[in-house]
């Protein structure tokens, strides 16, 4: 799915209002310095691509985060604010339903969610804005200068 035409500000608002709190709940008891963020993204569409991948695609050691509250809210936000996203996810949803019934929090899953927090942080606060657009410049732009 191409995330270029999403309403980024609405997705950001959804993240700050609810999704971030669910990620914090999932990570509760884990120090923010415990995992080193290694996954990065260059612009907002790329960030959403990486967020989708880490949230919904099974990985070694973390079979599925898709049934977690933050994942369900992420899916809802993308469905609402990214035109045509829902249609692309029908087959993926069927595969997820077959994947796993129970939720098990492993250290690998905690690390993955820590990476997700870094991706969301980057999505929310990119530094370079394109003229007249809600999207942002790529890394390889010739410019390349960049609590709770």
């Amino acid at each position: 799915y191409d995330f270029t035409n999403c309403d980024f500000e609405k997705i950001k608002a959804a993240y700050l209002s609810t999704i971030s709190k669910d990620l914090i709940t999932y990570m509760s008891g884990t120090k923010s310095t415990e995992f080193n963020n290694t996954v990065s993204c260059s612009n907002r569409p790329h960030c959403l691509t990486e967020i989708q991948s880490l949230t919904f695609n099974p990985t070694a050691g973390c079979a599925s985060l898709a049934k977690e509250m933050f994942a369900m809210k992420t899916k809802a936000a993308l469905a609402i604010w990214c035109p045509g996203y829902s249609e692309t996810q029908i087959n993926a949803t069927q595969a997820m339903k077959k994947a796993r019934k129970s939720k098990v929090t492993t250290n690998k899953c905690l690390e993955q969610v820590s990476q997700l927090q870094g991706l969301w942080r980057r999505f929310n606060r990119p530094l370079l804005k394109q003229q007249g657009s809600s999207d942002y410049k790529d890394d390889d732009d010739k410019h390349h200068h960049h609590h709770h």
């Epitope: 500000e9 870094g118 942080r121 370079l128 890394d139």
Partner: antibody, heavy 120, light 111 residues
Framework: EVQLVQSGAEVKKPGSSVKVSCKAS????????MHWVRQAPGQGLEWMGA????????SYNQKFKDRVTITADKSTSTAYMELSSLRSEDTAVYYC?????????????WGQGTTVTVSS | DIVMTQSPDSLAVSLGERATINCRAS??????????MHWYQQKPGQPPKLLLY???NLGSGIPDRFSGSGSGTDFTLTISSLQAEDVAVYYC?????????FGQGTKLEIK
């Protein structure tokens, strides 16, 4: 706990340049925006610019655009702010600050400040 | 640039009394229903410290006598019962539009 430690005070001549460093410890460096803010004696806070160390992307306050350069070295978790063509009105305390964990955009960790005095 | 104007420039309040600081933006700092306005406290010789984020959310470890309200262009920081340790300069900051800008500061003293 994340800490930002800045380089020591500097005294500079008008027309020269100054480079202030800000070393991060106790947490991930590359995926947080790092900002530079200055405060002239008895005055308010003024945002100068920021860098995303992950790829070196920067954003500058146009007021300083031609004179300030912000860089970062991921290998040493250090951000730098260089200000050129110094004048007396650049006398100030220069702070580095890191954005929060969640992308809210507030500055939750600050360096101790570096005093730069510009005098002939 | 968005200009942030705080009022008053200085304020003297008795211990235990309420202190109110206002911040007005030259244009709205709201986006998608959220207000991208933060408040900081700065004591002499120290860097600023976050008090409130997004207009009304208390920063980590900040006492609940501090509160914030407002949206769009008009925001208020309130200290419900002034304590001696609250003597400081207070700044509002908008992060909705580059360049990020701060108010000129409000100096709070004890009467």
């Amino acid at each position: 706990e994340v800490q930002l430690v800045q380089s020591g005070a500097e005294v500079k001549k008008p027309g020269s340049s100054v480079k202030v460093s800000c070393k991060a410890s106790g947490g991930t460096f590359s995926t947080y925006n790092m900002h530079w803010v200055r405060q002239a004696p008895g005055q308010g806070l003024e945002w100068m610019g920021a860098i995303y160390p992950g790829n070196g992307e920067t954003s500058y306050n146009q007021k300083f655009k031609d004179r300030v350069t912000i860089t970062a070295d991921k290998s040493t978790s250090t951000a730098y702010m260089e200000l050129s063509s110094l004048r007396s009105e650049d006398t100030a305390v220069y702070y580095c600050a890191r954005e929060d964990d969640y992308g809210e955009g507030y500055f939750d960790v600050w360096g101790q400040g570096t005093t730069v005095t510009v005098s002939s | 640039d968005i200009v942030m104007t705080q009022s008053p420039d200085s304020l003297a309040v008795s211990l235990g009394e309420r202190a109110t600081i206002n911040c007005r933006a030259s244009e709205s700092v709201d986006n998608s229903g959220l207000s991208f306005m933060h408040w900081y406290q700065q004591k002499p010789g120290q860097p600023p410290k976050l008090l409130l984020y997004r207009a009304s959310n208390l920063g980590s470890g900040i006492p609940d006598r501090f509160s914030g309200s407002g949206s769009g262009t008009d925001f208020t920081l309130t200290i419900s019962s002034l304590q001696a340790e609250d003597v400081a300069v207070y700044y509002c900051q908008q992060i909705n539009t580059d360049p990020l800008t701060f108010g000129q500061g409000t100096k709070l003293e004890i009467k």
